[in-house]
Amino acid sequence: VPPGEDSKDVAAPHRQPLTSSERIDKQIRYILDGISALRKETCNKSNMCESSKEALAENNLNLPKMAEKDGCFQSGFNEETCLVKIITGLLEFEVYLEYLQNRFESSEEQARAVQMSTKVLIQFLQKKAKNLDAITTPDPTTNASLLTKLQAQNQWLQDMTTHLILRSFKEFLQSSLRALRQM
């Protein structure tokens, strides 16, 4: 069920309409639910989830990650810088979410829902951001070649890539959720 359409909202017609922050919060939690379902399938069909961090670190994926310089941590917190980082990071994740689309059998719809919900989240956040000029959009040509390269990997590497994308995306969303609630 997409955010804002669950039974709780139906049962409470007197509830105030969701604020922008509440909508974003709910959207992130909805995407995290989807990731959780996808991770279940991934972990059930391969042993990637038990792999050590060291082995995972060898993979050379350039997945977005929150760092102190991004202004999302308590020390050096900067709302606008942080918002730009969150949006930029989500835009960078889009190519990896596209890669996930053909990686699931029983959770195919869930993978699509995560991808589409992320697009909606980006739109919500862009409305909140003041400095849209600072947001760099990934180059489509670079994304296309990256996608081709990822899809050409052997089965083991594709499983590893899937696991890494889900784990990193979950962590990025959690860091974003934490920062957005401080705003």
């Epitope: 929150m66 959690q174 860091s175």
Partner: antibody, heavy 119, light 106 residues
Framework: QVTLKESGPTLVKPTQTLTLTCSFS??????????VGWVRQPPGKALEWLAF???????YYSPSLESRLTITKDTSKNQVVLTMTNMDPVDTATYYC??????????????WGQGTLVT | DIQMTQSPSSLSAFVGDGVTMTCWAS??????LNWYHQRPGEAPELLVF???NLQIGVPSRFRGSGSETYFTLTINSLQPEDSGTYFC?????????FGGGTKLEI
Amino acid sequence: QVTLKESGPTLVKPTQTLTLTCSFSGFSLSTSGVGVGWVRQPPGKALEWLAFIFWDDDKYYSPSLESRLTITKDTSKNQVVLTMTNMDPVDTATYYCARSADDYLYYSFDTWGQGTLVT
Amino acid sequence: DIQMTQSPSSLSAFVGDGVTMTCWASQSINDYLNWYHQRPGEAPELLVFAASNLQIGVPSRFRGSGSETYFTLTINSLQPEDSGTYFCQHGHSFPLTFGGGTKLEI
């Protein structure tokens, strides 16, 4: 099984620095969504949140005590350390460390240490 | 900072009774509200997280509800072991704050 245990001095003189260690097992502080917090409770009074450290080393402090507190983690040793400078008799309390671990960051403390009384 | 206010500060009831205690937040905290139970000389124990989700192992006679600024914890069919102090805590953002507690005597 998740467990946490606080250790440190039971008696501290005024103006001294208190150093408390939280040793834990059954979870990793490098897993996203996981954090460890410190909470204190003066005798017969309510709970007071002090500090919190996340898996990615982001740290938060109680505004009223921020200048006196430092929280650090050693992931390899499964330990979190809280230091509190310039101790005063009003800081007499039972000090607890507690774990928070959920996907949506509700900051709910699902497992607590037994607590250590500091006078 | 978000302030948490609990009411009543104390109450007494008999085994088998039902009681309700409330917790108010000074601003909207969505459903980021947790409830704890503490017996004398013991560490607090998480009962309810996210306003209405029972922690694993907590009896179903406990029920949390509410959203935004108003929350309640209801205990049906009170048992002797339910005595102690109940604290609410918001988990919306930092700084985290606890309510002053509701002391329950059975």
